[in-house]
Interface confidence: medium
Amino acid sequence: AGVFELQIHSFGPGPGPGAPRSPCSARLPCRLFFRVCLKPGLSEEAAESPCALGAALSARGPVYTEQPGAPAPDLPLPDGLLQVPFRDAWPGTFSFIIETWREELGDQIGGPAWSLLARVAGRRRLAAGGPWARDIQRAGAWELRFSYRARCEPPAVGTACTRLCRPRSAPSRCGPGLRPCAPLEDECEAPLVCRAGCSPEHGFCEQPGECRCLEGWTGPLCTVPVSTSSCLSPRGPSSATTGCLVPGPGPCDGNPCANGGSCSETPRSFECTCPRGFYGLRCEVSGVTCADGPCFNGGLCVGGADPDSAYICHCPPGFQGSNCEKRVDRCSLQPCRNGGLCLDLGHALRCRCRAGFAGPRCEHDLDDCAGRACANGGTCVEGGGAHRCSCALGFGGRDCRERADPCAARPCAHGGRCYAHFSGLVCACAPGYMGARCEFPVHPDGASALPAAPPGLRPGDPQRYL
């Protein structure tokens, strides 16, 4: 177990032209807050996929009002770190998404409005217990500077927080099989912590997070007694040799605990150990209220004034999920026709059409040659939504309006003279050179110096001149 910590140093305009407008104004004061989402591994997951390693929301920053006429400065930031606790091993490689949110403090009906200012993402390798790593990420015209680290929560140590340590009992040595926890020379490895909820009575482990059952017990947490179908005692312990191991019904069967709660049996029923933010008999009650700002992407939070009443997020167009955390990928339906490029702008869907097509979904095929003549005897050719002119000899350009000068590009090498001709061009070569473009020197003995054969071709093979 441990904590991923993120320290935001600055958020403001990036270098270069096109400085962004300040997100706040005198008429519309605002403040910033940040959200971090962590996923294990180096996967290129979509922004909407679950934050499997955890997520955290910062506090709100100080209220900021733009000074009229001033460029957008680095904006005032919330105090403190963003901390994402992780319960299991630190994976070493992870993906992150850091979102900068603006909370507008105007006179909106229904409280403050939130909007996403910038989102940066990346994939990194990081060992737990190491120093702070510094990073700079750009999102459009904005620049975010931050540091991050992963640290283990005692008694866990090591680059993955899988070794467990406690103060050593003697100054010079650890207990049997317990190695010193370098670099903490005064600490020793400590016992394994089994999978959360693993029955202490009927389960044990020899690896962190494991739950192995003693005889007579089964289930993921060793809470289900093994019953005997053809044995004498219906719920007593059975011998491994009798072949009577049939899982019996247990109160934790099917895990009645919601929202990631872990189930443990009690003499009469079961008990759920709920993760932070949930409570109730089955962890079905969320302790989050609208005051915690649970709705992302500008979702409007309704209800939930006290912890016992649930909140509901009303999501803006383009977002869904109980917290408006999932972006609806409206482009996946391929609404743009004729090869148009789909742009999901959040508030609207936009199609960028290929040449020759128009309309909100690029559904209209334009007749490119209609009313568009090619000059100087050229003929209009339609193709793939774009028009082009096939020009008569001696003319070029998009509409065949330019007189073609074949000698303009100086095609004759080694001082050869170029002459325009009705069939193209002719090179008159300087003494000592030959070829259609005067490219080959003529040797004094009369043999021409032909280019060397490229690798894989024999001299004399005609392909080498193609």
Partner: antibody, heavy 120, light 112 residues
């Protein structure tokens, strides 16, 4: 019924060697960590060595480290303690004991013990 | 290693009386990650192997009568026998299994 039966004890001279065995029955031997615990005549209990269920990890008390080796053969349901460089202070009844689960669990079943006497 | 100190060394009581045995650890045997005390109590009679009574400081082992109970946390632990039966007169050992494995020196409960 869980049963642990030690054997191999006896009289040995200082510096000598002895190998103790513990035959286990009545439970799935390969699922449990096992220990050796000793008790000098008229004294208290002293833990000696332990081994995890698959034999991959072994643990020793400082007093026997480097001299004693614990091992197991899960196919024979047998636990062993190889004792080398024996000293007079190793004289004790040696008990074979089963843990409730892994190494970090209490011992729940004990054998009746085998006496090792180190004397010249 | 963690040192366990048991007191008293000898307890002289009559059948039916309440026995309170103490075990003090030189450092905590409470493991914060799972909030369990890695301490057990054993009963040993002359010429016999020890018998597990209590584990995790307060969980009674299978087949152990309800008159035996364990309590305490961290460094101070107690084994209580609510009403002594004739078969309870024996030596009792506390045992920690958190850092290495060590036993207390034992408390002998004898008939007064």
């Amino acid at each position: 019924e869980v049963q642990l039966l030690e054997s191999g004890g006896g009289l040995v001279q200082p510096g000598g060697s002895l190998r103790l065995s513990c035959a286990a029955s009545g439970f799935t031997f390969s699922s449990y960590a096992m220990s050796w615990v000793r008790q000098a005549p008229g004294k208290g209990l002293e833990w000696v060595a332990a081994i995890n269920s698959n034999g991959g990890n072994t643990y020793y008390a400082d007093s026997v480290k480097g001299r004693f080796t614990i091992s197991r053969d899960n196919s024979k349901n047998t636990l062993y303690l190889q004792m080398n460089s024996l000293r007079a202070e190793d004289t004790a009844v040696y008990y074979c004991a089963r843990h409730r689960g892994g190494f970090y669990y209490a011992v729940d079943y004990w054998g009746q013990g085998t006496l090792v006497t180190v004397s010249s | 290693d963690i040192v366990l100190t048991q007191s008293p060394a000898t307890l002289s009581l009559s059948p039916g009386e309440r026995a309170t045995l103490s075990c003090r650890s030189s450092q905590s045997v409470l493991y914060s990650s799972n909030q369990k005390n890695y301490l057990a109590w054993y009963q040993q009679k002359p010429g016999q192997a020890p018998r597990l009574l209590i584990y995790w400081a307060s969980s009674r082992a299978t087949g152990v009568p309800a008159r035996f109970s364990g309590s305490g946390s961290g460094t101070d632990f107690t084994l209580t026998i609510s009403s002594l039966e004739p078969e309870d007169f024996a030596t009792y050992y506390c045992h920690q299994y958190l850092s290495s494995r060590t036993f207390g020196q034992g408390t002998k409960v004898e008939i007064k």
